[in-house]
Amino acid sequence: MMTGTIETTGNISAEKGGSIILQCHLSSTTAQVTQVNWEQQDQLLAICNADLGWHISPSFKDRVAPGPGLGLTLQSLTVNDTGEYFCIYHTYPDGTYTGRIFLEVLESSVAEHGARFQIP
């Protein structure tokens, strides 16, 4: 029985050119995390394997950095990065847990209704 839950950073609105951190945390289970995949739509961004460490997809190498922890840092954001990101936790013996984060990247000039932008 899968008892775990995934907590995420929550949805994020950020400014073009900035950087953000996507993080998920698996709790309420003693299952062993064997691998965490980060995906956007149907694209694999990165893998963190318990034994083999990090692998960043070649097409994202310039703008994606591993960590902190099992999280992922996206740099030099573009409007095209807007979308839903998935953290997929492969665990034993529970199976797969998935978290979802929606990232909205706005043009630097957009400050509609006084929106606050985050650039850590």
Partner: antibody, heavy 119, light 112 residues
Framework: EVQLQQSGPELVKPGASMKISCKAS????????MNWVRQSHGKDLEWIGL????????SYNQKFKGKATITVDKASSTAYMDLLSLTSEDSAVYYC????????????WGQGTSVTVSS | DVVVTQTPLSLPVSFGDQVSISCRSS???????????LSWYLHKPGQSPQLLIY???NRFSGVPDRFSGSGSGTDFTLKISTIKPEDLGMYYC?????????FGGGTKLEIK
């Protein structure tokens, strides 16, 4: 003036599929997400999902995965929602609503499309 | 999914009254950057929902200043001072911090 014009009411048979349209005007269509929300008779509002016209990306409420498919036609500034394998439970008013940039809210809404599923 | 609970379900009022509607979420609506995505809507019979408040406390354009929003974390409030006839209808809060977005169950503002 921002306007979202939805297609008219529909009466469909159980098991059928249908498409609702939402034509946007008065703003840059690709600069804002488009959401879809439904209200079943006398029930709460439910967020179905959204689409990013700029890149075609989507996000769905898992409850509606396989039931709703959201697409856009950038050339005509129109968002569409396909509703599949309809049952009486899908009878509702469906709204499109523009996303409010930077706040994960919805600022302008279409007039709603009433869908009745009945044999 | 995040569960959003609104109270009361029904709120009988007289014109000129001041009222508060509460919205509580099953987990914090503040993201890792300190932003909270909680909005309020009014849905009148035969009309589309309309945005009143976004980002907890920001009034949308054209919304009268008798509407105000407050709160943090998991606890939020919409206050309406001096109720007018056009304020009657269903009020909904919406959390947009976590996927999927979820609405509260609604509060019906009606005449006593």
């Amino acid at each position: 003036e921002v306007q979202l014009q939805q297609s008219g009411p529909e009466l469909v048979k159980p098991g059928a599929s249908m498409k609702i349209s939402c034509k946007a005007s008065g703003y840059s269509f690709t600069g804002y997400t488009m959401n879809w929300v439904r209200q079943s008779h006398g029930k709460d509002l439910e967020w179905i999902g959204l689409i990013i016209p700029y890149n075609g990306g989507t996000s769905y409420n898992q409850k509606f995965k396989g039931k709703a498919t959201i697409t856009v036609d950038k050339a005509s500034s129109t968002a569409y929602m396909d509703l599949l394998s309809l049952t009486s439970e899908d009878s509702a008013v469906y709204y499109c609503a523009r996303g409010l940039r930077g706040y994960f809210a919805m600022d302008y809404w279409g007039q709603g499309t009433s869908v009745t599923v009945s044999s | 999914d995040v569960v959003v609970t609104q109270t009361p379900l029904s709120l009988p009022v007289s014109f000129g009254d001041q009222v508060s509607i509460s919205c509580r979420s099953s987990q914090s609506l503040t993201n890792s950057y300190g932003n909270t995505y909680l909005s309020w809507y009014l849905h009148k019979p035969g009309q589309s929902p309309q945005l009143l408040i976004y980002g907890i406390s920001n009034r949308f354009s054209g919304v009268p200043d008798r509407f105000s929003g407050s709160g943090s974390g998991t606890d939020f409030t919409l206050k309406i001072s001096t109720i007018k006839p056009e304020d009657l209808g269903m009020y909904y809060c919406l959390q947009g911090t976590h996927q999927p977005w979820t609405f509260g169950g609604g509060t019906k503002l009606e005449i006593k």
